[in-house]
Interface confidence: medium
């Protein structure tokens, strides 16, 4: 026990002695952050000149501060111990490590191309001021139907499968979809309204079924089927929209 204690004390003394010797041999190691070891002045610690910094001790030079020029603006001023930090002027956002570039903002429903901001093409959307237009969700891949059509700014909203909504289905009330995070009360209200409508249609259908002539009945059945057909995903089509196809880096949209 006493032997190990002696070893620890001996090690500590060695370390302390080494540090003291090192600082005697290299006076620069004593220079704190915000200073540099000035060889021209007998290795004394001089403060960093204006517009420069040293973030660690023992440095022989200070680094020039980053300059936030042009479209960049200063987010954090340079100090003697830390570099300046830049961000972008309004209407632009940062790109790259440490905001090495600024990129122009676009409106929702647009993406930035080499020719500037362009509207998202039919079938794509962008709900942010940056980034690219992404394709609408394909509801049918999950066996669902489109509840709310997609736009340039918003993705489609998928709902229960068409089978769950058809009037001839065994269950009158469609199964409540698992609520995804971010679903608003409006969508829940929409489902409730849809259920009520389905019930009303069913009652209306049963009432008229026996009182309508054969030809008229066929026509009526056609009308009933319409609301349950998969809606066409529509959006405002504008000239100069931006289409991005896998084989093209950038393509115009000939609609």
């Amino acid at each position: 026990m006493g032997n190990s204690c002696y070893n620890i004390v001996a090690t500590l003394l060695l370390v302390l002695n080494f540090e003291r010797t090192r600082s005697l041999q290299d006076p620069c190691s004593n220079c704190p952050a915000g200073t540099f070891c000035d060889n021209n002045r007998n290795q004394i610690c001089s403060p960093c000149p204006p517009n420069s910094f040293s973030s660690a001790g023992g440095q022989r030079t200070c680094d020039i501060c980053r300059q936030c020029k042009g479209v960049f603006r200063t987010r954090k001023e340079c100090s003697s111990t830390s570099n300046a930090e830049c961000d972008c002027t309004p209407g632009f956002h940062c790109l790259g490590a440490g905001c090495s570039m600024c990129e122009q903002d676009c409106k929702q429903g647009q993406e930035l191309t080499k020719k500037g901001c362009k509207d998202c093409c039919f079938g794509t959307f962008n709900d942010q001021k940056r980034g690219i237009c992404r394709p609408w969700t394909n509801c049918s891949l999950d066996g669902k139907s489109v509840l709310v059509n997609g736009t340039k700014e918003r993705d489609v909203v998928c709902g229960p499968s068409p089978a769950d909504l058809s009037p001839g289905a065994s269950s009158v009330t469609p199964p409540a979809p698992a609520r995804e995070p971010g679903h608003s009360p409006q969508i829940i209200s929409f489902f409730l309204a849809l259920t009520s409508t389905a019930l009303l249609f069913l009652l209306f259908f049963l009432t008229l079924r026996f009182s309508v002539v054969k030809r008229g009945r066929k026509k009526l059945l056609y009308i009933f089927k319409q609301p349950f057909m998969r809606p066409v995903q529509t959006t405002q089509e504008e000239d100069g929209c931006s289409c991005r196809f896998p084989e093209e880096e950038e393509g115009g949209c000939e609609l």
Partner: antibody, heavy 121, light 106 residues
Framework: EVQLVESGGGLVQPGGSLRLSCAAS??????????VSWIRQAPGKGLEWVSS????????YYADSVKGRFTISRDNSKNTLYLQLNSLRAEDTAVYYC????????????WGQGTLVTVSS | DIQLTQSPSSLSASVGDRVTITCRAS??????LAWYQQKPGKAPKLLIY???SLQSGVPSRFSGSGSGTDFTLTISSLQPEDFATYYC????????FGQGTKVEIK
């Protein structure tokens, strides 16, 4: 098409003055993020940045070698950039290029064809 | 000011060769580095910006890499039209260029 065209170069005696112009077309010099710069190249030598002006025109930058002698300015109504060269020295002899700082950064994406300034007695 | 040192200052190569040019900054500059190509009597042309982003219209045989103090321009397969002088440029603090690297025909 985005283009920069320099003019105003020529032969001048040491101590003399000259005014270089750079006419921009295809883009506006007054656009917020666009900076414009002058870069020179002495015969057979490398490129040397001389001066820059920010998109708003509120900030100017100069290389130490020309500070106090050269002045950068612009006329947004004419969409033209200028460089006033005073107290010219033999070492200022070079082809002077104007170049657009890329809208989103700090590099030069559009260059003019250059104009030659010769300082000699 | 921030100094940029290019190496080599000149090199001889043949068509099809892989060519590498390096640029060293006197201090860390993040990725604030661009590369230009200049042919005799012509203005420089931007090739690479932000250390590794290829400028629109520039062939994909040109590539850039690096960050901090050490940067590289690579031409994967040298073409006849690539014989020129190449410059690096920093925009971290004001603007400075490297001294240039001349690529000549072997």
């Amino acid at each position: 098409e985005v283009q920069l065209v320099e003019s105003g170069g020529g032969l001048v005696q040491p101590g003399g003055s000259l005014r270089l112009s750079c006419a921009a077309s295809g883009f506006s010099l007054s656009t917020g993020g666009v900076g414009v710069s002058w870069i020179r190249q002495a015969p057979g030598k490398g490129l040397e940045w001389v001066s820059s002006i920010s998109g708003s025109g509120g900030t100017t930058y100069y290389a130490d070698s020309v500070k106090g002698r050269f002045t950068i300015s612009r006329d947004n109504s004419k969409n033209t950039l200028y460089l006033q060269l005073n107290s010219l020295r033999a070492e200022d002899t070079a082809v002077y290029y104007c170049a657009r700082d890329d809208l989103y950064s700090w590099y030069f994406d559009v260059w003019g064809q250059g104009t030659l300034v010769t300082v000699s007695s | 000011d921030i100094q940029l040192t290019q190496s080599p200052s000149s090199l001889s190569a043949s068509v099809g060769d892989r060519v590498t040019i390096t640029c060293r900054a006197s201090q860390g500059i993040g990725s604030s580095l661009a590369w230009y190509q200049q042919k005799p009597g012509k203005a420089p042309k931007l090739l690479i910006y932000a250390a590794s982003s290829l400028q629109s219209g520039v062939p994909s045989r040109f590539s850039g890499s690096g960050s901090g103090t050490d940067f590289t321009l690579t031409i994967s397969s040298l073409q006849p039209e690539d014989f020129a002088t190449y410059y690096c440029q920093q925009g971290y603090y004001t603007w400075t260029f490297g001294q240039g690297t001349k690529v000549e025909i072997k």
